[in-house]
């Protein structure tokens, strides 16, 4: 049995149509263990592509050495050289370029808009619950609870600015101290990094692309988690963030100024407000224990209202509640008093889709969640395709060199810091770290930006989002100015501290190594990416939340053994890799544990069993849609089903399941990984529902 599926008798004489590029380079031993166990001999590695029927099929030659999967791919320039084009061709090429740019900007616009709508959808689905998290009085005494509330609320509302503004309102209203607010801000920082991780999941189709994209997204997660791991205990012990920010706030005599500039929102708001508009004050009101807010809808109905202060007769339970004794009376049934009542008159309804539907928040939220995820996914696919077609040959080389090359010696170390500044600046322009890091993710995936360069850009993004918060704080009204500024500064110094911990010395750039590790695992077992997302952003925070509610004794009772086991495993892992000889023979590897405790292979088999039935219909559907899409646009290879579907076909053919001969619009590319580079023993278990 061959290690990759062969194309049967698709063509009677393939040599007429195919130019082979073979290399006799042996597969390295460490990789060969991943390939099919029945055939690990030296294999001529061939990559071939069936080109459109109107052209002579030629094989694109590629370097075939089994290199570092983290090396950026060489994006081939398959087009005709500029010098070889005639005048008409050159004009056409220019127009194509402009067209692609317009399309790219269009899809980028809808990508950003869909992120905004996604945030609104999450707020509609989980906003009220998120608000109730804040109304828990234990936050005051338990920083760990504050942290997980920050994570959960930000994950539920998909917006760190929403959770931060709730915290600011609560601090301003003395419902929360700055000390209690700091862990929540740290949690919000973690929660905001879920957005680009979700975006990375959209690139699950191509294994190598997904490896890079997922690692590039999770580098943000790991930076935030590690920063909190170190800085939360430091803050609890020393209160350095609280003290430093208090000194800064007290040393300035601030006057609240202009509103923080809305830059990207100026372009996106006109579109997103046609889809849905939310009354975000409702979440804050719930957080501040306002019972009436629990029955209010988050969907804004009236956009133009007239607020008038009027004296009104209102009933009071007793004379003690009167505004003044002489302004109280009874009609014989109730006690009445005169109060200044703010009367809101509705003038004009909002102009969005859901204004007249009167659907419950949950229904609107679910509808928007599905739509925004579909648009997000569609835009991402199109952005990747357009970038893929643009970033070829010379253009790719120039861009890659510009972005990823360091300054000449001895200033190479400055490059990263410039990237931090660029990240901060870009985030300030788009006014959202989620938008910036989410836009970065596909670029990492397709190999335009290395993870090493994406890391400082992401760190800069973290700084950028706090500068926006500081500006917003300076523009806030007098009663909230101090608290909002102090909280914004806490956020700023927390990120600065994190950068000082995990960036200046290359050795300390742990988030990169951790993200790459996770990228490798997720590329091999794609279900693990979703598993990671659920565990880190939902299960762990919810578990800690539950244990915290049960009280300190329970939290410590469960937490200490768990932390002890984690430390033990980490120490053992470190010794196994650095100096295994100091360990007894049995502890030099993890084989003493059951397989399911140190390998994902058994879990993969289980998950494949569950997701298997959904794969074939899904891939079938994809092929049909793809064919229709290609027929409509008249391009024979504009659309290609995900690698996942091809892996599935290959796995079946390897087991003797006949696979149809390629048709006109099929674009079958057999890559190194299909030949065993990152293949599990049973290719059937490789492809999951993802």
């Amino acid at each position: 049995m061959a290690p990759w599926p062969e194309l049967g008798d698709a063509q009677p004489n393939p040599s007429k149509y195919l130019e082979g590029a073979t290399s006799q380079q042996p597969i390295t031993p460490d990789k060969s263990k991943e390939t099919n166990k029945t055939d690990n001999t030296e294999v001529p590695v061939t990559k071939f592509e069936l080109l459109p029927t109107y052209s002579t099929a030629t094989l694109i030659e590629e370097p075939t050495e089994v290199d570092d999967p983290w090396n950026l791919p060489t994006l081939q320039d398959s087009g005709i050289k500029w010098s070889e084009r005639d005048a008409k061709g050159k004009i056409l090429c220019v127009f194509q370029g402009i067209g692609r740019l317009i399309l790219l900007l269009g899809f980028l616009y809808f990508f950003v808009c869909s992120l905004d709508v996604l945030s609104s959808a999450f707020q509609l689905v989980g906003g009220k619950m998120a608000g109730q998290f804040f109304s828990n009085s234990s936050i005051m005494s338990n920083p760990l609870l504050g942290l997980v509330i920050g994570v959960l609320v930000t994950v539920f509302v998909q917006s760190s600015s929403t959770s931060t503004s709730i915290v600011v309102s609560m601090v301003a209203s003395s419902l929360l101290t700055v000390r209690a607010a700091i862990p929540i801000i740290m949690g919000a920082n973690i929660g905001t990094s879920i957005t680009n991780t979700i975006v990375a999941l959209m690139q699950v189709g191509d294994r190598s692309e997904f490896r890079r994209a997922f690692a590039g997204a999770t580098v943000h997660d790991f930076f935030n988690w590690l920063s909190v791991l170190v800085l939360l205990p430091v803050e609890v012990a020393t209160h350095y963030l609280e003290v430093v920010t208090q000194l800064i706030v007290e040393s300035f005599h601030f006057k609240n100024g202009e509103d923080a500039p809305d830059l990207l929102k100026v372009i996106t708001k006109p579109f997103t407000k046609l889809i849905v508009q939310l009354d975000k004050k409702v979440i804050s009101q719930i957080a501040m224990n306002d019972e009436t807010a629990k029955n209010k809808s988050l969907v804004k109905i009236w956009c133009k209202t007239f607020t008038n202060m009027t004296q009104m007769n209102v009933t009071v339970p007793s004379m003690a509640n009167c505004t003044s004794h002489s302004l109280c009376w009874t009609d014989g049934i109730q006690i009445w008093t005169m109060k200044n009542v703010t009367y809101k008159e509705n003038i004009a309804k909002c102009q969005h889709i859901f204004v007249n539907f009167h659907l419950p928040d949950l229904a609107v939220g679910i509808i928007l969640l599905i739509i925004s995820l579909l648009v997000l996914c569609g835009c991402l696919i199109m952005i990747v395709k357009i970038l893929g077609s643009v970033l070829k040959g010379q253009v790719a080389t120039v861009i890659k060199k510009t972005i990823n090359t360091d300054f000449p010696f001895p200033f190479a170390w400055l490059t990263g810091y410039l990237a931090i500044l660029v990240g901060a600046g870009m985030t300030f322009i788009v006014q959202s770290s989620s938008v910036f890091t989410s836009a970065l993710t596909p670029l990492i995936g397709i190999g335009v930006i290395t993870i090493e360069r994406a890391y400082p850009l992401t760190l800069g993004s973290n700084i950028g989002t706090t500068t926006t918060a500081i500006l917003a704080a300076l523009a806030s009204p007098g009663n909230t100015l101090r608290s909002s500024l102090q909280i914004a500064l806490c956020h700023f110094f927390f990120n600065i501290s994190g950068i000082l911990l995990w960036y200046p010395i290359p050795f300390t750039r742990l988030p990169i190594r951790m993200a790459k590790g996770l990228g490798n695992i997720s590329a091999k077992y794609r279900w693990f990416a979703v598993f990671y997302l659920i565990i880190f952003f939902f299960l762990i925070p919810l578990t800690v939340f539950g244990l915290s509610l049960a009280g300190w004794p329970v939290l410590v009772g469960v937490g200490v053994p768990v932390v002890f086991i984690i430390i033990l495993v980490l120490c053992l892992r470190l010794l196994q890799s650095r100096c295994p000889r100091v360990l007894p023979k049995k502890l030099q590897n993890w084989n003493f544990l059951p397989l399911c405790m140190h390998s994902l292979k058994p879990w993969d088999a289980v998950i494949s069993k569950f997701t298997g039935p959904f794969q074939m219909p899904c891939c079938c559907c994809c092929r049909v849609c793809c064919r229709v899409c290609c027929l409509l646009c008249g391009c024979p290879k504009c659309c290609r089903c995900s690698k996942c579907c091809q892996d599935l076909e290959e796995g079946q053919e390897a087991q003797g399941v006949p696979v149809k001969a390629p048709e006109t619009f099929d674009n079958i590319t057999i890559s190194r990984e299909a030949q065993g580079e990152v293949r599990a023993p049973d290719s059937k278990t490789e492809c999951t529902a993802l």
Partner: antibody
Amino acid sequence: QVQLQQPGAEVVKPGASVKMSCKASGYTFTSYIIHWVKQAPGQGLEWIGAIYPGNGDTSYSQRFKGKAKLTADKSSSTAYMQLNSLTSEDSVVYYCARGNNYGSPAWFGYWGQGTLVTVSA
Amino acid sequence: DIVLTQSPVTLSVTPGDRVSLSCRASQSIGNFLYWYQQKSHESPRLLIKYASQSMSGIPSRFSGSGSGTDFTLSISRVETEDFGMYFCQQSNSWPVTFGAGTKLELK
């Protein structure tokens, strides 16, 4: 013009209950509160309670809780007061009076003629 | 409950006299005080509302004054039809309460 009509007298046995009426006319019955006031012969006035026919809300003076029950029939524009467990001390005059709109201070611009309740075996 | 104390209990006057009837509240009631006149075998009649506002159809010789805790009903020239009982009532605090009354009689 506004009128409140009450039966002149009611004779009841001790321990029994009486339900006296107050028929309103000349205004919108549901818009004004009806109050009931007790007056012993040669004595002062004592407020018993009030009812707002618009929504049926009632309020009773502490002394008359459980003793008096106020109701109103919108269709006949009539207010009723039922007094339970009557004793000789309840042999007094009971007035109905029209108060103001719901939420306006209580003063009584119009009074019924009063019903004299006589409790005797 | 707010207690209204009326004084004097009985006032004997001759027609043409000027009289002042007093009503004192146990606590401040603003201007939520009303004066009623009740003749023998008749229902009470509202004379003054909100301590000083005369009701329509009430002779101009009746006037009210005061606020807070001390209130006065004045009759500038007593006429024979003015004899009877005079009650004050408050609606500042629940429940509504009446004063015990002042009897205006012929001397």
